[in-house]
Interface confidence: medium
């Protein structure tokens, strides 16, 4: 994992601000999982990061992700989850200036750094159809959603509201 | 912003009953949840019930499971907790809050929106 500790030094005044012109209602630091409590980690190689799906040990420290929430005013495809036709909207970033990316060409999930206002690939919209997981889906992109494919993330696209409970583009939040 | 107002509580006998109500108000989004907490005099704040926002999960204490029950009027925009079969331990000044689903359901970190509490004392 690199750097994490630098995303414990985040402050609300570092995301707040110019992001599409609006603050988050609230911002969480957490560790993301699958489905089936695998842990997703960020890795430093050859000057640019790569996102991973894996298995830690034991004692291994979780990365941490800062996940930015902000309203929505543009409802998503897939129907049911929001109220008035509001949604929420999530950034992930897992240290400073870097976020995640929608890369809907390559149906890939990366790490870009990026200046504030964020692109809309770096949004996505929050759906909580299955207990407590969460799945985020491409704002860019209505029906496609980051998912686990071969111990990464990939864009998974989803046909009918029943596949939104298929495990592989749910995940957990965890403050551990 | 969400706006939270608790009401119904109030003195009840032990093995009694008692509904305490939340109201919310504000803008809401399908991907909250709902949350009732509770704190006795000294105490920490302790994790009671929760409901998703379309009522179809449900968690609870296991402190009061088999006694209490959590509901929403959608409608009304209201979430209840009926509580049956009173204890004097679950004397204690009751919230409701709204947190963001995925985040552990019973950490008061994972509530970003808190309603000023309504009473409930439980004596004979």
């Known amino acids: 994992a690199f750097g994490i500790s630098g995303v414990q030094k985040y402050t609300r005044a570092l995301h707040d601000s110019s992001i599409t012109g609006i603050s988050p209602i609230t911002e969480y630091l957490a560790s993301l999982s699958t489905y089936n409590d695998q842990s997703i980690t960020f890795a430093l190689e050859d000057e640019s990061y790569e996102i991973y799906v894996e298995d830690l040990k034991k004692d291994e420290k979780k990365d941490k992700v800062l996940l930015s929430y902000y309203e929505s005013q543009h409802p998503s495809n897939e129907s049911g989850d929001g109220v008035d036709g509001k949604m929420l909207m999530v950034t992930l970033s897992p240290t400073k200036d870097f976020w995640l990316h929608a890369n809907n060409k390559e149906h890939s999930v990366e790490l870009h750094k990026c200046e504030k206002p964020l692109p809309d690939q770096a949004f996505f919209v929050l759906h909580n159809m299955h207990s407590n997981c969460v799945s985020f889906e491409c704002k860019t992109d209505p029906g496609v959603f980051i998912g686990v494919k071969d111990n990464h993330l990939a864009l998974i696209k989803v046909d009918s509201s029943e596949n939104l409970c298929t495990e592989n583009i749910l995940f957990k939040l965890s403050e551990t | 912003q969400v706006q939270l107002v608790e009401s119904g509580g109030g003195l009840v006998q032990p093995g009694g009953s008692l509904r305490v109500s939340c109201a919310a108000s504000g803008r809401t989004f399908n991907t909250f949840r709902t949350g009732w907490f509770r704190q006795a005099p000294g105490k920490e704040r302790e994790f009671v019930a929760s409901l998703n926002w379309s009522s179809t999960w449900t968690s609870y204490a296991d402190s009061v499971k088999g006694r209490f029950s959590i509901s929403r009027d959608s409608a009304k925009n209201t979430v209840y907790l009926q509580m049956n079969s009173l204890k004097p331990e679950d004397t204690a000044d009751y919230y409701c809050?709204?947190?963001?689903?995925?985040?552990?359901?019973?950490?008061?970190?994972?509530?970003?929106?808190w309603g000023q509490g309504t009473q409930v004392t439980v004596s004979s």
């Open positions: 809050a709204v947190g963001i689903a995925g985040t552990p359901v019973m950490r008061a970190t994972s509530y970003i929106y």
